[in-house]
């Protein structure tokens, strides 16, 4: 058993049918010695008396808010949560496996640049009685500071019969140098509590591996005289690290017909312009990627050929 | 990814082309190592990230773009002195910092070159003959060093009398390639920045 926060405790259980569970001793936080009784949640049934209460925690029915009283007055509370260990592996019931970029990916994180700011998000089908708390650091043995905000519900989607909820959090490394070569990964830890179930999820990454630039901005077309060709131009996104000559991007320019089946013409360039043939009803899209370290491509910025 | 390779203009900063080749070569070598050593811990998540140049050179700090010198987190000032007569500086008015930067890059390359050559000698003794260093990568390191053209004492190749542990050598190769790829990215950024200024 360990303390998650004041008066909230997590009982770790080897979770299998007929398991013996864990013996837990609760102590009433009071100078009183006599006439103390204990109850669980809203029930008025007295579970025991005395300054301490010994319970065998086996299942969720044994978890909840234990309260010690004296003469009708509440003295203190202890909330017991359960953390299930199933065959040596901590349960992951609360969050959905996003399966990207690999199986067992519960937290996904992205950064728009090298400033040390990043966003993580996760999915669940649970709509109520759910709380999250996020902590982060650079490295784990001698951790350096990363400050995270509160997790917020950022999207709701309908997936088949189920509703899916996306939560996200923004974090900022306290003293980040955009040019630094990372040798210790960022660690992100999310505590999830659903009713009386506790779970924790972690992700470990280097900022350089989660970079996904914003799409190029100011995408414009300039027709070339007496030609079907157009000059496409764009700019670096505002959120990208500066100076751009140091944090350079490379670009992919795509000409796509109306039909998805039509052949796509693609050109790669390090410049912020390109000359392409504009077909009728086609659209031109441009996306960006770090020129020197191949992390994710940005989303496409698009303009119609007409 | 297969991107068209830009050939440098004659007036272009002489080292940019070499640094682009270097990054391409080390990335290819790392990919090859990951595939060949699939049963070894060779991914970024599995290896310890060690920097053999730590406390010996200060490339990131010495080559910091002017715009980032206002960022206190980037000014991890380390006193390091280097020789300053590189040919990449030809026909350009350069500051002491720029010379310091390029000589720091040269020292990095020299250190990695020694490590890679020592390691290759061990790998050549492996009866499994599973993996060797790409000669192209070693040649590209050499070309960039020549382009930088700094006078520096030659570091003797490390020789080891004990029987090599091939498993450890291969893991060390992965660690070294990951670190060198990160340094090659920094070098490329620096060359691109200097070329633009």
């Amino acid at each position: 058993i360990w303390e998650l926060k004041k008066d909230v405790y997590v009982v770790e259980l080897d979770w299998y049918p007929d398991a013996p569970g864990e013996m837990v001793v609760l102590t009433c936080d009071t100078p009183e010695e006599d006439g103390i009784t204990w109850t669980l949640d809203q029930s008025s049934e007295v579970l025991g008396s005395g300054k301490t209460l010994t319970i065998q925690v086996k299942e969720f029915g044994d978890a909840g808010q234990y309260t010690c009283h004296k003469g009708g007055e509440v003295l203190s509370h202890s909330l017991l949560l359960l953390h299930k260990k199933e065959d040596g592996i901590w349960s992951t019931d609360i969050l959905k496996d996003q399966k990207e970029p690999k199986n067992k990916t519960f937290l996904r994180c992205e950064a728009k640049n090298y400033s040390g700011r990043f966003t993580c998000w996760w999915l669940t089908t649970i709509s109520t009685d759910l709380t999250f708390s996020v902590k982060s650091s650079r490295g784990s043995s001698d951790p350096q500071g990363v400050t995270c905000g509160a997790a917020t519900l950022s999207a709701e989607r309908v997936r088949g019969d189920n509703k899916e909820y996306e939560y996200s959090v923004e974090c900022q490394e306290d003293s980040a140098c955009p040019a630094a070569e990372e040798s210790l990964p960022i660690e992100v830890m999310v505590d999830a509590v659903h009713k009386l179930k506790y779970e924790n999820y972690t992700s470990s990454f280097f900022i350089r591996d989660i970079i996904k630039p914003d799409p190029p901005k100011n995408l414009q077309l300039k027709p070339l005289k007496n030609s079907r060709q157009v000059e496409v131009s764009w700019e670096y996104p505002d959120t990208w690290s500066t100076p751009h000559s140091y944090f350079s991007l490379t670009f992919c320019v795509q000409v796509q017909g109306k039909s998805k089946r039509e052949k796509k013409d693609r050109v790669f360039t390090d410049k912020t312009s390109a000359t392409v043939i504009c077909r009728k009803n086609a659209s031109i899209s441009v996306r960006a990627q770090d020129r020197y370290y191949s992390s994710s491509w940005s989303e496409w910025a698009s303009v119609p050929c007409s | 990814r297969n991107l068209p390779v830009a050939t440098p203009d004659p007036g272009m900063f002489p080292c940019l082309h070499h640094s682009q080749n270097l990054l391409r070569a080390v990335s290819n070598m790392l990919q090859k190592a990951r595939q060949t050593l699939e049963f070894y811990p060779c991914t970024s998540e599995e290896i310890d990230h060690e920097d053999i140049t730590k406390d010996k050179t200060s490339t990131v700090e010495a080559c910091l773009p002017l715009e980032l010198t206002k960022n206190e987190s980037c000014l991890n000032s380390r006193e390091t002195s280097f020789i300053t007569n590189g040919s990449c500086l030809a026909s350009r008015k350069t500051s002491f910092m720029m010379a310091l930067c390029l000589s720091s890059i040269y020292e990095d390359l020299k250190m990695y070159q020694v490590e890679f050559k020592t390691m290759n000698a061990k790998l050549l003794m492996d009866p499994k003959r599973q993996i060797f260093l790409d000669q192209n990568m070693l040649a590209v390191i050499d070309e960039l060093m020549q382009a930088l053209n700094f006078n520096s004492e030659t570091v003797p190749q490390k020789s080891s009398l004990e029987e090599p542990d091939f498993y450890k050598t291969k893991i060390k190769l992965c660690i070294l390639l990951h670190a060198f790829r990160i340094r090659a990215v920094t070098i490329d950024r620096v060359m691109s920045y200097l070329n633009a200024s």
């Epitope: 979770w15 299998y16 007929d18 199933e86 065959d87 019931d93 | -």
Partner: antibody, heavy 115, light 112 residues
Amino acid sequence: QVQLVQSGGGVVQPGRSLRLSCAASGFTFSSYGMHWVRQAPGKGLEWVAFIRYDGSNKYYADSVKGRFTISRDNSKNTLYLQMKSLRAEDTAVYYCKTHGSHDNWGQGTMVTVSS
Amino acid sequence: SYVLTQPPSVSGTPGQRVTISCSGGRSNIGSNTVKWYQQLPGTAPKLLIYGNDARPSGVPDRFSGSKSGTSASLAITGVQAEDEADYYCQSYDRGTHPALLFGTGTKVTVLG
């Protein structure tokens, strides 16, 4: 004590269907994940499928994906395996088992796919 | 389809020490715990070892398990006639959990 009693096995022609059941008692069935494991005659153990305690997630071996469906009825304390498009290579003893560090197995039920 | 490799058979005379190996990889045994089962002919498997080296109550202490790196082993010290059975190791793969990964199985023969 914990008990898993299996039923539903038998002889079936290739291409036909069969449903296996596993009735649980002696524990809170709705709190635990469940597996199906099979063993072809004279061969080793092969995992078939898993279902979460609440039925929200199901996992299958590649060899049965798209043909077999694992399900549970927590109100009846019963686990099921619906097997469709059966093949000769599905011939085996099928076991249900609880998920956890200490597990309990059903007695097994024989499924023979033969023409 | 078996990722955990066991020797097909091992044998020993009563009282001898018999060991069975189970060889896997970094993503399975290297990252997860190992179980061992005993299966007597015509019966369901019986759990002998869980969590690499822990014995459930009722399992004789002549059975012991261990794990090192990407391999695990089961030892029977002072093998007895009633130990003649098939033995299976089991683990998980970190990418496909909760799918069970079973070993190829080992037939233990007690001679004499």
